[in-house]
């Protein structure tokens, strides 16, 4: 895949190694940790990003911070198994043979078990609710301006078509962005809502995954929108299977 032509870097993923060894001497980039070739015109899958993040040397892992708001059942970061397309494998296990099932965004959706645990299919996360609290401003943002700006941001920065931004709700200082995407709705080249949400989350935390691009500078009619808290809720096409003791 072609990356940036002039200096052979990957604009959409700084956690890559790039070299001009593609067809015809074109720039090709591979994700750290997995060595999988990535398409630098679009977002890299969250699974490959998480794998790259875990492979980085501890002292060089400038992108990693304690993730106080991550809704991953407090499991935190883990080194995932990805399929050849870069998607999470339905079953994930750690080095101590503890296994669990995940959804398409890599969030655990069952109790933990042993190697005998079966995860029949990768269950799709079809609805993501991004809950933001913005810092105090002189007045509330205009709702329609905020809606338009967030749709533009998700299209231009994360390449997510506005059809997948189902709604933007606003009650100062809380903003809720609803992303919806069924398996059947994804057409060729469409970005996955899970990947868009992950890139957005990292941007909001000041841990941008983009190469050489400035951090997230979100403005609504020139007024800076600064996020001070993020919570992300994931809804799967099939409800999760946790025991009652949870």
């Amino acid at each position: 895949h072609t990356a940036a032509q002039d200096n052979c870097t990957c604009p959409t993923n700084k956690m890559t190694v790039c070299s001009p060894d593609g067809p015809g001497g074109r720039c090709q980039c591979r994700a750290l940790g997995s060595g999988v070739a990535v398409d630098c015109s679009t977002l890299t899958s969250e699974c490959l990003l998480l794998k790259a993040r875990m492979s980085a040397p501890k002292n060089a892992r400038t992108l990693v911070r304690p993730n106080e708001h991550a809704l991953v059942d407090n499991d935190g970061l883990y080194d995932p198994d990805c399929d050849p397309e870069g998607r999470f494998k339905a079953r994930q296990c750690n080095q101590t043979s503890v296994c669990w099932c995940v959804n398409s965004v890599g969030v655990r959706r069952t109790d933990k078990g042993d190697l005998s645990l079966r995860c029949d299919e990768l269950v799709r996360t079809h609805h993501i609710l991004i809950d933001l609290r913005h810092r105090p401003t002189a007045g509330a943002f205009n709702h329609s301006d905020l809606d338009a700006e967030l749709r533009r941001l998700f299209r231009e920065r994360y390449r997510l078509h506005p059809k997948f931004v189902a709604a933007v709700h606003y009650e100062q200082p809380t903003i809720q962005i609803e992303l919806r995407q069924n398996t059947s709705q994804k057409a060729a080249g469409d970005v996955d809502i899970g990947d868009a949400a992950y890139y957005f989350e990292r941007d909001v935390k000041g841990e941008s995954l983009f190469q050489g691009r400035g951090g997230l500078d979100l403005r609504v009619r020139g007024e800076p929108l600064q996020v001070e808290r993020t919570l992300i809720y994931y809804l799967d096409e099939i409800p999760p299977k946790f025991s009652m003791k949870r």
């Epitope: 749709r151 069924n182 059947s184 080249g189």
Partner: antibody, heavy 119, light 108 residues
Framework: QVQLVQSGAEVKKPGASVKVSCKAS????????MHWVRQAPGQGLEWMGE????????SYNQKFKGRVTITRDTSTSTAYMELSSLRSEDTAVYYC????????????WGQGTLVTVSS | DIQMTQSPSSLSASVGDRVTITCRAS??????LNWYQQKPGKAPKLLIY???RLESGVPSRFSGSGSGTDFTLTISSLQPEDFATYFC??????????FGQGTKLEIK
Amino acid sequence: QVQLVQSGAEVKKPGASVKVSCKASGYTFTSYWMHWVRQAPGQGLEWMGEITPSDNYGSYNQKFKGRVTITRDTSTSTAYMELSSLRSEDTAVYYCARGHGNYVSFDYWGQGTLVTVSS
Amino acid sequence: DIQMTQSPSSLSASVGDRVTITCRASQDISNYLNWYQQKPGKAPKLLIYYTSRLESGVPSRFSGSGSGTDFTLTISSLQPEDFATYFCQQGYTLPPYTFGQGTKLEIK
């Protein structure tokens, strides 16, 4: 091989509506965006709108102010573009084109349908 | 809407010439720029997508470059079948997606 075959030329009177069809073959119809682009005689290309055949979602060029409607019939792998309240400046060749969700590039085009608006 | 401006509007060249057509966007469009070739009475044909990626089956004499607002389409050695009209198109932002006005390449 991928093919987009459009309906034949139309002559319409001002104020009337026209519905152009585009039958797709050679690929999974619901897996690609379908766009409509028009070209007035001797002029450039103008994007009119798009649809995802999987769920009938459409978005449109606001220039057409609600005059354009794009639909599809998945059972026949056919997309349709209807333009209402026709005026003489709508005389153009209308193309359907298969699109890519990320690049928004149009890799296969129909042969075009000439719509003439004349009283 | 993003405006796309091509230059020149027309140009004359000979077989074997190296030809460059430029396209300028009214705002940053990253690399989401596509090029098409159209011959009289025919539908446009995709040549290059995402600034520099050659569409399958397109001869390697066609190449594209640029980023941000300024882009170029280069034909390294003109062939008789290359005389046509060329359009650029952006796919960066929210709809509508917009085209340049076209560059007509004629035989000198």
